[in-house]
Interface confidence: low
């Protein structure tokens, strides 16, 4: 009598998550009489997947009619596959008895599930940094299978090399996660720059997933300050200008100090953007020279994005300007309230 063979022709089957998996199994003989059962895994902890006689297996259906006379095909189809279904499936023949006795097992078919990685999420540094400093961006994607995956970083289309990438877990798993950190050296021109994390995986068929982050969220470009005096007007008023240039972000407060005393405070808002994404701002102060006996020290004080204030001072030389008659007396009488500073 020919020995019964349980034939599982495929050593492995790969299925996309959500699809159906067909696990093939045929037997070489109708005898001895007894049922076929499907298990995931081997040994005492194996999991029953399908048993024609009893149990409820809503996602498992036989490929051919198992009640048909002389049926030797015990292949099954598992619907709506998820990564949790991965594993090695065994078709096992039992000899009828009380209880049934395991007779022979197929060689097993390893089911691997192809699952797409989630959209990469890129997160940047918690605090802004200035040019020439290095900041780190992190990219994460989850839930993919198989483990092989490619992750690349780009800044303005150019691939970054200072990258550290880990795929977890290291061992066998139903699905995997990837986490990568890229270190980027900032330049003053990076307000409009973008970093891209690109993930390529077998399930994506050549259309990589991308996550992006704008360097505008990570960079601070400190302003340049310049204080200048315009030529004196006919009414003895001097126009002093504070030019604040090439700064980012827009959050900026400017304070004028006259001989150390606060004269006026302004907040930047709705400024036009430079081509490189930075901002410029100009503030003017009119000083009535005839109202002063001594030189006036004007200070333009700028607080940018919560950073310590930056000062630029300028002395208006009162002695260099002719006074109107009686103006000294007037200045002494009026005190500090009427300095004609606007």
């Amino acid at each position: 009598e020919e020995e019964l063979q349980v034939i599982q022709p495929e050593k492995s089957v790969s299925v996309a998550a959500g699809d159906s998996a067909t696990l093939n199994c045929t037997v070489s003989s109708l005898i001895p009489v007894g049922p076929i059962q499907w298990f995931r895994g081997a040994g005492p902890g194996r999991e029953l997947i399908y048993n024609l006689k009893e149990g409820h297996f809503p996602r498992v259906t036989p490929v051919s009619d198992p009640t048909k006379r002389n049926n030797m095909d015990f292949s099954i189809r598992i619907s709506n596959i998820t990564p949790a279904d991965a594993g090695t499936y065994y078709c096992v023949k039992f000899r009828k008895g009380s209880p049934d006795v395991e007779l022979k097992s197929g060689a097993g078919t390893e089911l691997s599930v192809r699952a797409k990685p989630s959209a990469p999420v890129v997160s940047g540094p918690a605090v802004r940094a200035t040019a020439e400093h290095t900041v780190s961006f992190t990219c994460e994607s989850h839930g993919f299978s198989p483990r092989d995956i490619t992750l690349k970083w780009f800044k303005n289309g150019n691939e970054l090399s200072d990258v550290q990438t880990n795929v977890d877990p290291a061992g066998k798993s139903v699905s995997y996660s990837i986490r990568s950190t890229a270190r980027v050296v900032l330049t003053r021109r990076d307000v409009h720059s973008q970093v891209i994390c690109e993930v390529a995986h077998v399930t994506l068929q050549g259309d990589p997933l991308r996550g992006t982050a704008n360097l505008s969220e990570a960079i601070r470009v400190p302003p340049f300050l310049e204080v200048t005096q315009q030529s004196m007007r006919a009414d003895n008023q001097v126009n002093v200008t504070c030019q604040v240039t090439k700064f980012y972000p827009q959050r900026l407060q400017l304070t004028w100090l006259e001989n150390g005393n606060v004269s006026r405070t302004e907040m930047a808002s709705a400024l036009p953007e430079n081509k490189d994404g930075t901002y410029n701002w100009t503030s003017w102060l009119l000083v009535n020279v005839s109202a002063h006996r001594d030189d006036v020290k004007l200070t333009c004080q700028v607080e940018h994005d919560g950073q310590p204030a930056v000062n630029k001072s300028f002395s208006v030389k009162v002695s260099a300007h002719p006074k109107e008659q009686g103006s000294n007396t007037a200045a002494e009488n009026t005190g500090t309230n009427e300095r004609n500073i606007y």
Epitope: D148, T150, K152, A200, V202, Q205, G206
Partner: antibody, heavy 118, light 112 residues
Framework: QVQLQESGPGLVKPSGTLSLTCAVS?????????WSWVRQPPGKGLEWIGE???????NYNPSLKSRVTISVDKSKNQFSLKLSSVTAADTAVYYC??????FGVGPWGQGTLVTVSS | DIVMTQSPLSLPVTPGEPASISCRSS???????????LDWYLQKPGQSPQLLIY???NRASGVPDRFTGSGSGTDFTLKISRVEAEDVGVYYC?????????FGQGTKVEIK
């Protein structure tokens, strides 16, 4: 959806240089893909010419390597093929195509027939 | 170079019937990562080739499930469970394991 379009002269003189450009639309040439050239002589099968990655790395068919140059222009989102010292045997439909890191070649351009003749 | 050999070179088919094409490589296309770097393409008359199957057994996006790729190592098969009139054309296998990428000679499928 990524689409590719070949362009270039349809007639090249023997010993001259064949030059073709492939414009990529609907996607970035800087993505994780290789950009390929494949040709098909009239009535014959497919022959792989070579491929380029956006970084400039190239792979060429050894049988053509001495005559082939593939280059990429990221600013124009296109890549190009130059085949020098052509003969009548180089008459073929030339296809540009994308090859993913993990998958086969596709999509393909519609192909352009280049005839080598005086 | 890896040599790809297809058979048959011509395959007359009847609509509704199954069809099978074989592709053999001169060396194993099984990578250490477990994938077989073998693709199948269909070139319909007057058209560019289109990707059907990649990495041995994975159907490309939009490809009907009547197309199935199988095999490992050096022997691969493309099966069409029920041929339809629109399936006529030349089928090519291609190895992507090494450069130069190499194609089979092609199998011409036509309706009987």
């Amino acid at each position: 959806q990524v689409q590719l379009q070949e362009s270039g002269p349809g007639l090249v003189k023997p010993s001259g240089t064949l030059s073709l450009t492939c414009a990529v639309s609907g996607g970035s040439i800087s993505s994780s893909n290789w950009w390929s050239w494949v040709r098909q002589p009239p009535g014959k099968g497919l022959e792989w010419i070579g491929e380029i990655y956006h970084s400039g790395s190239t792979n060429y068919n050894p049988s053509l390597k001495s005559r082939v140059t593939i280059s990429v222009d990221k600013s124009k989102n296109q890549f190009s093929l130059k085949l020098s010292s052509v003969t009548a045997a180089d008459t073929a439909v030339y296809y540009c195509a994308r090859r993913g890191i993990w998958f086969g070649v596709g999509p393909w351009g519609q192909g352009t027939l280049v005839t080598v003749s005086s | 170079d890896i040599v790809m050999t297809q058979s048959p070179l011509s395959l007359p088919v009847t609509p509704g019937e199954p069809a099978s094409i074989s592709c053999r490589s001169s060396q194993s296309l099984l990578h250490g990562n477990g994938f077989n770097y073998l693709d199948w393409y269909l070139q319909k008359p007057g058209q560019s080739p289109q990707l059907l199957i990649y990495l041995g057994s994975n159907r490309a996006s939009g490809v009907p499930d009547r197309f199935t790729g199988s095999g490992s190592g050096t022997d691969f098969t493309l099966k069409i469970s029920r041929v339809e009139a629109e399936d006529v054309g030349v089928y090519y296998c291609m190895q992507g394991l090494q450069t130069p990428r190499t194609f089979g000679q092609g199998t011409k499928v036509e309706i009987k």
